[in-house]
Amino acid sequence: PLATIPVSTTSLTSSEGSTISTPSVDISTPVTTSIVGDQCSRCKNGGFWDGLKCQCLTPYYGESCEEVVNSIDIAPPETVSAQMELTVTVTSVKFTDELKNHSSQEFREFNKTFTEQMNIVYSGIPEYVGVNITNLRLGSVVVEHDVLLRTKYTPEYKTALDNATEVVKQKITKVTTEQIMTNDNCSALMCFNTTGTQVQNITVTQYDPVEECRQKAEEYEDYFLVEYRDQKPYCISPCESGFNASKNCNHGKCQMSQNGARCLCVTTETHWYSGEDCNQGTQKSHHHHHH
């Protein structure tokens, strides 16, 4: 239910004995209040009363879920992967119906040899995980299979996986050109038909920290941004200190509103502070400006 909350004034005392006066509720924002039984908990912004306190939804916190956090946890996956759907034609094995049955001795042996061969082919690719045969069909043996690639998540993971898929293409093209039958005989572990090598499809893990950050920031999505530290993405508002995008409020406190980050300037015993960044000090006694 919607409720009207009386607006109170909060006075914050700084370490030097100064006060910040700010309305604790943004009166331009409709406030939803969670009521459980007779207990009007005043949990705002979708928060709910658990019997003891307000349980707030991201990106809110505080006694009544009225404040916006400065940073939101985003968790990129530890690893990211790519799957390449490939087809090669093996000429050193003749197709038999038993190969269609994945539990047959024929399939198991073919799978073992094919896996060994592909492990050799892709041995120089650090992202290579393995192969998975999806289908075998007639035409000597047409092998439909997936090549699986994996790498640690970094901001450049897409480039790393794209490069790895290119190397896979080069290596499979090379081996299927070189390892061919001579006089109806194969001297390699497996022999191939050069023209039967095709890359059908490539699927790369999609992870966008910016998108996750925007989604979790909800109506504050335009004011939260992603910055990296040690290759790890952080979803921050300008009120979070220590980042390039951090807002310097000088003699004030940074607070998020639906219009973005703003500085709430302090008043000390000796000065009034004003300006967008609270950097304009006016001495109370002499009305003198310091910049």
Epitope: K94, A188, C191
Partner: nanobody
Framework: DVQLQASGGGLVQPGGSLRLSCAAS????????MSWFRQAPGKEREGVAI???????GYADSVKGRFTISQDNAKNSLYLQMNSLRAEDTAVYYC?????????????????WGQGTMVTVSS
């Protein structure tokens, strides 16, 4: 588990003949392939001959016209008839089997192996 046992090796003079046999524990490979490999002292194992269930046979260039591979499915046996033997044919001979209809004389393509039998060609 599949068992393969090669036999028939021995000492023979250059130009002589020998017949090697390989007994399989069952007829598992009657629909796949069987082959002979050899390994001379200090050298890598190399393919000699191959026979598949579809009747196809293949030989290493060094033995073509001198060696003949054959199979008796009723007896679960593989044979290698070796004629016009030379000193360079001296090696331990192994039989190998596969469930696949193979066209490969690379030892790595074969998963089932028998014990070897020694063939020495010397005057």
């Amino acid at each position: 588990d599949v068992q393969l046992q090669a036999s028939g090796g021995g000492l023979v003079q250059p130009g002589g003949s020998l017949r090697l046999s390989c007994a399989a524990s069952d007829n598992t490979f009657s629909r796949g392939s069987m082959s002979w490999f050899r390994q001379a002292p200090g050298k890598e194992r190399e393919g000699v001959a191959i026979i598949s269930s579809d009747g196809w046979t293949g030989y290493a260039d060094s033995v073509k016209g001198r060696f003949t591979i054959s199979q008796d499915n009723a007896k679960n046996s593989l044979y290698l008839q070796m004629n016009s033997l030379r000193a360079e044919d001296t090696a331990v001979y192994y039989c190998a089997a596969s469930f696949l209809v193979l066209r490969a004389l690379n030892p790595k393509a074969w998963h089932y192996w028998g014990q070897g039998t020694m063939v020495t060609v010397s005057s």
